[in-house]
Amino acid sequence: MMTGTIETTGNISAKKGGSVILQCHLSSTMAQVTQVNWEQHDHSLLAIRNAELGWHIYPAFKDRVAPGPGLGLTLQSLTMNDTGEYFCTYHTYPDGTYRGRIFLEVLESSVAEHSARFQIP
């Protein structure tokens, strides 16, 4: 039985040219996280964080995506095209797969703020 829940940074905004942290957190389960996959709205893979094998960064993003913090992802040099949905897929044992959603809006405005519902140290 899957008892866990995924918390995410929810709907966030950041300014063009800036950076943003995409973060999910799995709670309420003792399941072991074996891998986290990060995908974009079109289901293209941004990155994989495997607990043992480390990080895979999709080549198209290698200059703009930084691993971490933690199981999260830092997306840099934002463009308007980065606006959209992002999904974190947690592969766990023995529970199975959990999925979280984040919506990122990239704003032209220099006063855009990146706000999150929670922070992970």
Partner: antibody, heavy 119, light 107 residues
Framework: EVQLVQSGAEVKKPGSSVKVSCKAS????????IHWVRQAPGQGLEWMGG????????IYNQIFRGRVTITADKSTSTAYMELSSLRSEDTAVYYC????????????WGQGTTVTVSS | DIQMTQSPSSLSASVGDRVTITCRAS??????VVWYQQKPGKAPKLLIY???YRFTGVPSRFSGSGSGTDFTLTISSLQPEDFATYYC?????????FGGGTKVEIK
């Protein structure tokens, strides 16, 4: 030049164990994961598992059900794969391969080690 | 586990031919697919990754495409040194799995 040099061919009895070595050179050993892949005669490729020399983490293909152990000696930049409880169907060529940095693709491979299991 | 199914399992072609090999995943693997080339008695060599980036030194006649579940390796003009077996592999989730291989033979 990146090189992975494996130990020589082995002939083993059913029920015994084999330990294959893979000596890496030409790069910083701790910066790249080492994988093991095998190929039975005339067959395709089968991923056995990987070892991260940076923190010592290992991951295994569960079809081997605890029969495989991957280790490394950082001081000699050598990775090892031990397979126990050998049976005839374990007869294969065993390859070590390096994963590219921040990429789950195996960019350099050892020459292969033939393991024959026969009574 | 994710199954990777390659087709055809073998094909005969002539030098200069355009060759297409397909690989289908049993479930979504996004763009987490790699292609290898293997010649008899030799270790596999990395050709294409993610799934359209050529590895260092791989000739431009090799190209890869696809996303989701369907992937293609294309050799635009087959050369004598291209006669080999080609494997796709997914790394979307562990265990990493390979296709059964496609043997490209001389017609």
């Amino acid at each position: 030049e990146v090189q992975l040099v494996q130990s020589g061919a082995e002939v083993k009895k059913p029920g015994s164990s084999v330990k294959v070595s893979c000596k890496a050179s030409g790069y910083t050993f701790t910066e790249h994961v080492i994988h093991w892949v095998r190929q039975a005669p005339g067959q395709g490729l089968e991923w056995m598992g990987g070892f991260n020399p940076n923190h010592g983490g290992t991951i295994y293909n569960q079809i081997f059900r605890g029969r495989v152990t991957i280790t490394a000696d950082k001081s000699t930049s050598t990775a090892y794969m031990e397979l126990s409880s050998l049976r005839s169907e374990d007869t294969a060529v065993y390859y070590c391969a390096r994963a590219a940095k921040l990429l789950f693709a195996m960019d350099y491979w050892g020459q292969g080690t033939t393991v024959t299991v026969s009574s | 586990d994710i199954q990777m199914t390659q087709s055809p399992s073998s094909l005969s072609a002539s030098v200069g031919d355009r060759v297409t090999i397909t690989c289908r995943a049993s479930q979504h693997v996004s763009n987490a697919v790699v292609w290898y080339q293997q010649k008899p008695g030799k270790a596999p060599k990395l050709l294409i990754y993610s799934p359209s980036y050529r590895f260092t030194g791989v000739p431009s006649r090799f190209s890869g495409s696809g996303s989701g579940t369907d992937f293609t390796l294309t050799i635009s003009s087959l050369q004598p040194e291209d006669f080999a077996t080609y494997y796709c592999q997914q790394h979307y989730s562990t265990p990493w799995t390979f296709g059964g291989g496609t043997k490209v033979e001389i017609k």
